[in-house]
């Protein structure tokens, strides 16, 4: 029932895509949780931030993340509709000057302090496989998504569009 695997189809395109503006097109402050309603939390430990996936106690406040949305021009040769082929890319910042980064060598998701312009490792292609769930695909490693592994965030390789629906790469955003 699925079309050509989106993952396979735009592998080259992501490497070639360019952010069309240096300013985000919109921004949201939201809490991030897994498909199974575990919260993504951030803790300062030994002068660096750790990322956890955990059940919060009742009435415990959820950590917020600033999601900045950027338009990225999809290369027209990869696209059936020429210049209109745009993707949304996001950066995720839980605290000032820190952004989520994809560490493709270690298959890990890390928080790095950095200045703008942000490196490509901080950009993730936004997918809505479901209307109330999002997935984050590495700009630097197409087909690799932020996912949940052993109560931590990790990078997970997705090899077909069917697997884009697997629960461990689906996240919920809540602005409340």
């Amino acid at each position: 029932a699925f079309g050509i695997s989106g993952v396979q189809k735009y592998t080259r395109a992501l490497h070639d895509s360019s952010i069309t503006g240096i300013s985000p097109i919109t921004e949201y402050l939201a809490s991030l949780s897994t498909y199974n309603d575990q919260s993504i939390t951030f803790a300062l430990e030994d002068e660096s931030y750790e990322i956890y996936v955990e059940d919060l106690k009742k009435d415990e406040k959820k950590d917020k993340v600033l999601l900045s949305y950027y338009e990225s021009q999809h290369p027209s040769n990869e696209s059936g509709d020429g210049v209109d082929g745009k993707m949304l890319m996001v950066t995720l910042s839980p605290t000032k000057d820190f952004w989520l980064h994809a560490n493709n060598k270690e298959h890990s998701v890390e928080l790095h302090k950095c200045e703008k312009p942000l490196p490509d490792q901080a950009f993730f292609v936004l997918h809505n496989m479901h209307s109330n769930c999002v997935s984050f695909e590495c700009k630097t490693d197409p087909g690799v998504f932020i996912g949940v592994k052993d109560n931590h965030l990790a990078l997970i390789k997705v090899d077909s569009s069917e697997n884009l629906c697997t629960e461990n790469i689906l996240f919920k955003l809540s602005e409340t």
Partner: antibody, heavy 122, light 107 residues
């Protein structure tokens, strides 16, 4: 060139059913969320529902849940709206519309079909 | 659901006039707003999205501003082809809701 072409509209009696179709071309159908939006004669616009052809996931305006269903046929690059228990107030032009972004729904309508008129009357 | 209220519901203007249409949301919607133009018997056309971003091919005389609950669509110098009905729409969150429309007529 992106094209969305609706069909299936017509005259139907109250309580009857109708299935609208939207044929998509000029883009990769499975990569975009696609919506139905309607407009009653002389009135404003009202969003009905959206679907992501890749996964089949859908999202409805609560006002239409239970009576209307949205579906797709990826092999035919087509979108459908099955409308049951139709009422006089469902009389409208029904548009198929698509957003500007691959893979993501922001519920923005960058491309529209020409619309198909549904008239519910006895 | 968040309600979108447009004003005025109609206005008369001449070619070359500066025209301003406002849209008010019943709750804070950030910059999640789009503007469309619709001519009789035709489908709407996207003009502005995320409050102030002109869509591909839209003339520079169209501009959008605002955030939170109050938004404005401005046509800096009205052209003959701009006589139409304009709608605002709350985007991003479901359900997307439209304003009632503003009809721009020839004076």
């Amino acid at each position: 060139e992106v094209q969305l072409v609706e069909s299936g509209g017509g005259l139907v009696q109250p309580g009857g059913s109708l299935r609208l179709s939207c044929a998509a071309s000029g883009f990769t159908f499975t990569d975009y969320w696609v919506s139905w939006v309607r407009q009653a004669p002389g009135k404003g616009l009202e969003w009905v529902a959206e679907i992501y052809p890749n996964s089949g996931a859908d999202n409805f305006n609560e006002n239409f849940k239970g009576r209307f269903t949205i579906s797709r046929d990826n092999a035919k690059n087509s979108l459908y709206l099955q409308m049951n228990s139709l009422r006089a107030e469902d009389t409208a032009v029904y548009y198929c519309a698509r957003g500007p972004y691959y893979y993501s729904t922001q519920i923005i309508f960058a491309y529209w079909g020409q619309g198909t008129l549904v008239t519910v009357s006895s | 659901d968040i309600q979108m209220t447009q004003s005025p519901s109609s206005l008369s203007a001449s070619v070359g006039d500066r025209v301003t249409i406002t849209c008010k949301a019943s709750q804070n919607v950030g910059n999640n707003l789009a503007w469309y133009q619709q001519k009789p018997g035709k489908a709407p056309k996207l003009l502005i999205y995320y409050a102030s971003n002109r869509y591909t091919g839209v003339p520079s005389r169209f501009s959008g501003s605002g955030s939170g609950t109050d938004f404005t669509l401005t046509i800096s110098s009205l052209q003959p082809e701009d006589f139409a009905t304009y709608y605002c729409q709350r985007i991003y969150n479901s359900p997307p809701t439209f304003g009632g429309g503003t009809k721009v007529e020839i004076k």
